[in-house]
Interface confidence: low
């Protein structure tokens, strides 16, 4: 009777029984698998060829029979050594061994490239017992082979703590070439040489590589894989692919685009994010980078005033984050702003120019030529000054702020006055006699209060001491001008 079981981890019983006489070295399987005429779904390799002694591991049993005859060595019978087949075909191969019935527990396991094959593999073990020995055939089948099934398969049997190993069965799965390295998309400088690499493997070998550029073959003769294509240079974008040929046919790689680096397109959508009196925050959308990373950008600023000298201020910045604060601008001024960016090839054209204005700011300078004098008859202090220069007013003047500090023995008091924009003089009442009055003036716009002028001091005597000499803003450089009366 034939016993058939799926390969599992448990040992198979080997039908103990007497074993007089010599070992039977060949068995005809009790189960045959005929193929339909003209159609062979899988390769079937019969393992039970009698042959020369096995060269692999051999277990020499020490057990003897009643007559004390030593048992012959246990070894797997020879089988096919090398199976070549196409991808997706089926294959079945096996190993066989005749084991004396004296051995109770044996297991046959399949190994591939040094690792045991466990789990859902189609491994079947068949037993053919007779009086003295049991022939065991372990079959391994793969219904649709893949490249990953390539390798060296062996059977192992453990018996009496000995391990018997079969000769390897090499499975070689042949198919269309398989790419291990395909060309990569690149951005290259015009008329500059570059390399593309293509590598494909079988089996079967050899694999020959043909290069294709824009659907036309490049090389008249193919090269053995791997192939490096040196392109002497391009003047326009091209698509490259490679064809890998072997005896099974042709595989075509992905097409890769080789772009020619060019100067970038100009930035677009330059916009004003924020304006102050002396700065403008702008942003822009970068144009196409010309297949080469942006390195930096240049912001060009020119006064929009037709009477200006037309000079352009240039501010360089990094390409990111597409944002720049233009500083050191004049308040209440109109500017034209353009942006240009560069890559390794060169500068883009300038973006469309946009108009931007700074806001009003506080004046940047104080009123000039401040003069203070005492008008004793009216018990007033007269203050005179000159407007700051128009360009430095940073806005439309709305007036002036006057600070006057009165200091006398142990007493100090500061008063602030606001005066209208049209005047250039003011009169304040004497607050304290026999005291020093310190006066400072600042210009005021809607943007705020500008810096105060340097302090000017005047002594206000007790009643009856007359002096008409004025105090005034000193020449620059004197830190604490005091006019001694």
């Amino acid at each position: 009777a034939i016993t058939e079981a799926r390969e599992e981890a448990k040992p198979y019983p080997l039908f103990p029984g007497p074993f007089p006489g010599s070992l039977q070295t060949d068995h005809t399987p009790l189960l045959s698998l005929p193929h339909a005429s003209g159609y062979q779904p899988a390769l079937m390799f019969s393992p039970t060829q009698p042959g020369r002694p096995h060269t692999g591991n051999v277990a020499i049993p020490q057990v003897t029979s009643v007559e004390s005859k030593p048992l012959p060595p246990l070894a797997f019978k020879h089988t096919v050594g090398h199976i070549i087949l196409s991808e997706h075909k089926g294959v079945k191969f096996n190993c066989s061994i005749s084991v004396p019935n004296i051995y109770q527990d044996t297991t046959i396991s399949w190994w591939k490239d040094g690792k045991e094959l466990l789990g859902a593999h189609h491994a079947i073990t068949q037993f053919y017992p007779d009086d003295e020995v049991t022939a065991i055939i372990a079959s391994f089948s793969i219904t649709s082979v893949q490249r990953s099934d390539n390798g060296s398969y062996i059977c192992k049997m453990k018996i009496n703590n000995e391990e018997i190993v079969s000769d390897p069965i090499y499975i070689e799965v042949q198919g269309l070439p398989h790419f291990t390295k395909q060309p990569e998309s690149m951005n290259v400088t015009r008329n500059t040489a570059f390399n593309l690499t293509c590598q494909a493997v079988g089996p079967p070998e050899p694999v020959n590589i043909f290069w294709v550029q824009n659907s036309s073959r490049v090389n008249e003769q193919p090269e053995k894989s791997p192939s490096v294509l040196t392109v002497p240079g391009l003047t326009e974008m091209a698509v490259f692919s490679c064809e890998a040929h072997n005896d099974k046919g042709l595989t075509v790689s992905k097409g890769v685009q080789i772009n020619i680096k060019a100067i970038p397109s100009p930035p677009t959508e330059v916009s004003i994010r924020n304006s102050t009196a002396h700065s403008i925050l702008i942003s822009w959308v970068p144009g196409f980078d010309g297949y080469s990373p942006f390195r930096n950008c240049s912001i060009q600023v020119k006064e929009a005033d037709p009477l200006s000298n037309g000079s352009v201020m240039i501010f360089n910045t990094s390409a990111l984050p597409h944002l720049y604060q233009i500083k050191q601008l004049q308040a209440l001024a109109n500017y034209s702003i353009g942006v240009s960016c560069m890559n390794e090839i060169g500068w883009s054209a300038v973006s469309p120019w946009i108009l931007a204005s700074t806001t009003e700011g506080a004046p940047s300078v104080a009123p000039l030529n401040v003069t203070v004098f005492l008008n004793e008859s009216s018990d007033n202090v007269d203050i005179r000054w000159m407007k700051p220069p128009t360009k430095q007013q940073d806005g439309e003047l709305v007036g002036y702020r006057i600070s006057h500090v009165w200091q006398s023995a142990g007493i100090s008091k500061e008063l602030l006055e606001e005066v209208g924009q049209n005047g250039s003089r003011a009169r304040i009442s004497v607050q304290v006699h026999n005291a020093t009055c310190t006066v400072r003036i600042a210009a005021v716009t809607r943007g705020g209060v500008g810096p105060f002028s340097d302090p000017v001091k005047i002594f206000i005597p007790a009643h009856g001491w007359v002096d008409y000499a004025p105090s005034s803003t000193p020449a620059p450089g004197n830190a604490d001008p005091v006019l001694i009366i």
């Epitope: 020959n208 659907s215 073959r217 193919p222």
Partner: antibody
Framework: QVQLVQSGAEVKKPGASVKVSCKAS????????INWVRQAPGQGLEWMGW????????KYNEKFKGRVTMTTDTSTSTAYMELRSLRSDDTAVYYC?????????????WGQGTTVTVSS | EIVLTQSPDFQSVTPKEKVTITCSAS???????FHWYQQKPDQSPKLLIK???NLASGVPSRFSGSGSGTDFTLTINSLEAEDAATYYC?????????FGQGTKLEIK
């Protein structure tokens, strides 16, 4: 199986043109070159050029440049070779042959040949 | 262009004899680029040996090829009557692709 079937014999006058066809079957037409090789009576084989049907890429023997044009019709898997300004020494059997580039270049299948006779 | 010169141009041989045809190239050719064809009377040429020594499909094992560099050889080990034909060598190394002038083999 791979087959290359050529058009029938032609008789032409000097100065005329001839167009020979070669219909391929049994393989993917666009994957292999079609070469044209001629053989004058009692002479050896002379390569004229090839065409790659997938993109129409051609390579001609300098000797025939300007007189020969190779084309294909992929819809019918047919290759054509036109030779112009015929002379009497163009009398030959013209073969189409499939080019196999492992390694370049051999001809693994041949048509049966088309005899072209140039005579006044 | 690469010129291929075959020797001899003609050979008359009796069956079972061994025949050697040589082909000399004007430039060095890698063995992968060298091929042989057989052309029987009134037939198309047929690929006989590719890449110097690899028999084409269906070619009897009595045919063999060898050589390297500039000198290549076609050998027929035990000639049979059906081997009467003209044999051509061919290089695939550079364009224009070229053939030898041919060696005509006659069976006595």
């Amino acid at each position: 199986q791979v087959q290359l079937v050529q058009s029938g014999a032609e008789v032409k006058k000097p100065g005329a043109s001839v167009k020979v066809s070669c219909k391929a079957s049994g393989y993917t037409f666009t994957t292999y070159d079609i070469n044209w090789v001629r053989q004058a009576p009692g002479q050896g084989l002379e390569w004229m050029g090839w065409i790659y049907p997938r993109d129409g890429y051609t390579k001609y023997n300098e000797k025939f440049k300007g007189r020969v044009t190779m084309t294909t019709d992929t819809s019918t898997s047919t290759a054509y070779m036109e030779l112009r300004s015929l002379r009497s020494d163009d009398t030959a059997v013209y073969y189409c042959a499939r080019g196999y580039y492992d390694n370049l270049y051999y001809f693994d299948y041949w048509g049966q040949g088309t005899t072209v006779t140039v005579s006044s | 262009e690469i010129v291929l010169t075959q020797s001899p141009d003609f050979q008359s041989v009796t069956p079972k004899e061994k025949v050697t045809i040589t082909c000399s190239a004007s430039s060095i050719i890698s063995s992968n680029y060298f091929h042989w064809y057989q052309q029987k009377p009134d037939q198309s040429p047929k690929l006989l040996i590719k890449r110097t020594s690899n028999l084409a499909s269906g070619v009897p094992s009595r045919f063999s090829g060898s050589g390297s560099g500039t000198d290549f050889t076609l050998t027929i080990n035990s000639l049979e009557a059906e081997d009467a034909a003209t044999y051509y060598c061919q290089q695939g190394r550079s364009v224009p692709l070229t053939f030898g002038q041919g060696t005509k083999l006659e069976i006595k």
